[in-house]
C-alpha cells in the first residue's frame, strides 16, 4: 500500500507493519446514487451471449450473497434466435475484495480475501488453434 | 449482517450495533489459485462489443486501482468487422466493495464502500420504445 | 411533447474548435441515442456520429473520426458535438436528432446551428 | 460506405397530380435482422428535416397519406399521389442499415 504519514486525529494502531489488522467501520457508505439498477438487469437475458444467475452463499463471508454469472450457451446466439458455434460466449471475470471471518464464526475479526466471480458473459471470436 | 454466535476464542469487541468497527486484517488471502488470468485477458479485444480498459486510481481507497471497462463502441462489431448500430455494446456493470480511509489519510481506520464498476461489456438487442 | 433545442450560430478561425450543444426535453434522455447530422451551405445531409447518453458510448463516421468527439450531459439532458481542426469545408448547419430504433432513424431534429470557419 | 443516387434531383409538379423520387443503394439495405432500414425525409426551406417514411414504407406520425413508400434490397420508390403546395422542398432518402448511415443527394420538387 501507499505509504500516508498518519493524521494526529486517527484511531491508534499497535502494528503498523504487513500483515496489518485495521479497523473497518462496517457501515457501508453507497457510491452508486445516480445509478439505475433497473436499466442493466435483464441485459442476461437481451445479450447475445445470455446468462444465468447462481445465488453463492456463505455465512462466513461479507457480503454473505454473491451472484455468479454461468454462460447459458457455448455458442452466441443469432438474429433469428438460433446459436452459432463459430462464436463463443464466455464469462467476463472480476477478482473481488470479500471479508472472510476469522477465526470463523467470529463477528467482529476477519480477513481480507480475494476471490473470482463471474459477472456476465460476452461473445468473442474464437481463438484458432492451426493444426501442425 | 447475520447473527452468529461468538466464540470465546473471537478477539474482543466493544460495539456490537450497526454501524459497527470490526478488525480485518489485511493479509490477502486468494482463493483464485487454479484460475489463469490469460485466459479471459484478451475478451476486451475478441469480443463482438470489444472495451478499453482505464485506470481509476485513488489513494485513499484500497484497493487504490481499479479497472474500468468502456465499450469502444455504441454497437456491436460484425464478422465483416464493421459495426451494427440495431445491436448495443453495454458495460456489465457490478457492485463491488472497497475500503475508504476513514478519516482521510488514516493508514489504519476505513469504512466499507460500494462502487460500482464496469467489468466489460456485452452485445444486447436495443429496447425499442414505441414512438407516442 | 419532444423537443431538441441547439446553441446558436458560431463563427470560427480556421484551425480553431467548435462545440455545439443540443438539450432535450419532452421525453426521457437515457432512452434514446442523439445522431449528428451536418449540411454544407446548397449541399446534402451527411451524417457525423452518434451517442447513447445513458452510457456515453459513441459511434463515428470514419471520414471525421479524430476530429469529432459527441458527449453527453446526462444531468442537463444535453448532447454535445465538438469539432476541431475547423477548416472552411466545415462550414455547415449541424443537426442533433434524436434516433429510436421503433423509426429506426432520426425522427426529432433540432432546429440546426449554423457554424462558420472564416478567417 | 453505402451510396445511395436519387432520381431524378429535381422535379416541377402540378399542384394535384402525382409525383415519383427513385432511391438506389449500392449494396442491399436489409438488415439481419430482417427490417429495412431505408427513410425518407423532406427539408422544407429554411426547415430542418421531417422524417416522412420510415422502414420502407411506414408514414410517420402526422404525415398524409397521400405520401407512400415501397421497395426492397437495393431498389426504393417514394410516391406523392396528388402533390400540393405545401410539398415543396428537398427530398432525401436514407438508409441506417449499415455504417456510416447515408443519404441521397435530395430531390428537389417544386409547383408548376
Known amino acids: 500500500g501507499i505509504a500516508i504519514p498518519r493524521n494526529s486525529g486517527c484511531p491508534n494502531s499497535e502494528d503498523k507493519n504487513f500483515p496489518r489488522t485495521v479497523m473497518v467501520n462496517l457501515n457501508i457508505h453507497n457510491r452508486n446514487t445516480s445509478t439505475n439498477p433497473k436499466r442493466s438487469s435483464d441485459y442476461y437475458n437481451r445479450s447475445t451471449s445470455p446468462w444465468n444467475l447462481h445465488r453463492n452463499e456463505d455465512p462466513e463471508r461479507y457480503p454473505s450473497v454473491i451472484w455468479e454469472a454461468k454462460c447459458r450457451h457455448l455458442g452466441c446466439v443469432k438474429a433469428d434466435g438460433n446459436v452459432d458455434y463459430h462464436m463463443n460466449s464466455v464469462p467476463i471475470q472480476q477478482e473481488i475484495l470479500v471479508l472472510r471471518r476469522e477465526p470463523r464464526h467470529c463477528p467482529n475479526s476477519f480477513r481480507l480475501e480475494k476471490i473470482l466471480v463471474s459477472v456476465g458473459c460476452t461473445c468473442v471470436t474464437p481463438i484458432v488453434h492451426h493444426v501442425a | 449482517g447475520i447473527a452468529i454466535p461468538r466464540n470465546s476464542g473471537c478477539p474482543n469487541s466493544e460495539d456490537k450495533n450497526f454501524p459497527r468497527t470490526v478488525m480485518v486484517n489485511l493479509n490477502i488471502h486468494n482463493r483464485n489459485t487454479s484460475t489463469n488470468p490469460k485466459r479471459s485477458s484478451d475478451y476486451y479485444n475478441r469480443s463482438t462489443s470489444p472495451w478499453n480498459l482505464h485506470r481509476n486510481e485513488d489513494p485513499e481507497r484500497y484497493p487504490s486501482v481499479i479497472w474500468e471497462a468502456k465499450c469502444r463502441h455504441l454497437g456491436c462489431v460484425k464478422a465483416d468487422g464493421n459495426v451494427d448500430y440495431h445491436m448495443n455494446s453495454v458495460p456489465i456493470q457490478q457492485e463491488i466493495l472497497v475500503l475508504r480511509r476513514e478519516p482521510r489519510h488514516c493508514p489504519n481506520s476505513f469504512r466499507l464502500e460500494k462502487i460500482l464498476v464496469s467489468v466489460g461489456c456485452t452485445c444486447v438487442t436495443p429496447i425499442v420504445h414505441h414512438v407516442a | 411533447q419532444v423537443q431538441l433545442v441547439q446553441s446558436g450560430a458560431e463563427v470560427k478561425k480556421p484551425g480553431s474548435s467548435v462545440k455545439v450543444s443540443c438539450k432535450a426535453s419532452?421525453?426521457?434522455?437515457?432512452?434514446?441515442?442523439i445522431s449528428w447530422v451536418r449540411q454544407a451551405p446548397g449541399q446534402g445531409l451527411e451524417w457525423m456520429g452518434v451517442?447513447?447518453?445513458?452510457?456515453?458510448?459513441?459511434d463515428y463516421n470514419q471520414r471525421f473520426k479524430g476530429r469529432v468527439t459527441i458527449t453527453a450531459d446526462e444531468s442537463t439532458s444535453t448532447a454535445y458535438m465538438e469539432l476541431s481542426s475547423l477548416r472552411s469545408e466545415d462550414t455547415a448547419v449541424y443537426y442533433c436528432?434524436?434516433?429510436?430504433?421503433?423509426?429506426?432513424?432520426?425522427?426529432?431534429w433540432g432546429q440546426g446551428t449554423l457554424v462558420t470557419v472564416s478567417s | 460506405d453505402i451510396v445511395m443516387t436519387q432520381t431524378p434531383l429535381s422535379l416541377s409538379v402540378t399542384p394535384g397530380q402525382p409525383a415519383s423520387i427513385s432511391c438506389r443503394s449500392s449494396?442491399?439495405?436489409?438488415?439481419?435482422?430482417?427490417?429495412?432500414?431505408l427513410h425518407w425525409y423532406l427539408q422544407k426551406p429554411g426547415q430542418s428535416p421531417q422524417l416522412l417514411i420510415y422502414k420502407v414504407s411506414n408514414r410517420f406520425i402526422g404525415v398524409p397519406d397521400r405520401f407512400s413508400g415501397s421497395g426492397s434490397g437495393t431498389d426504393f420508390t417514394l410516391k406523392i399521389s396528388r402533390v400540393e403546395a405545401e410539398d415543396v422542398g428537398v427530398y432525401y432518402c436514407?438508409?441506417?442499415?449499415?455504417?456510416?448511415?447515408?443519404f441521397g443527394q435530395g430531390t428537389k420538387l417544386e409547383i408548376k
Open positions: 419532452g421525453y426521457s434522455f437515457t432512452d434514446y441515442h
Open positions: 449494396q442491399s439495405l436489409k438488415h439481419s435482422r430482417g427490417n429495412t432500414f
Open positions: 451517442i447513447n447518453p445513458e452510457y456515453g458510448t459513441t
Open positions: 436514407s438508409q441506417s442499415t449499415h455504417y456510416p448511415f447515408t
Open positions: 436528432a434524436r434516433y429510436d430504433y421503433f423509426t429506426g432513424t432520426g425522427a426529432y
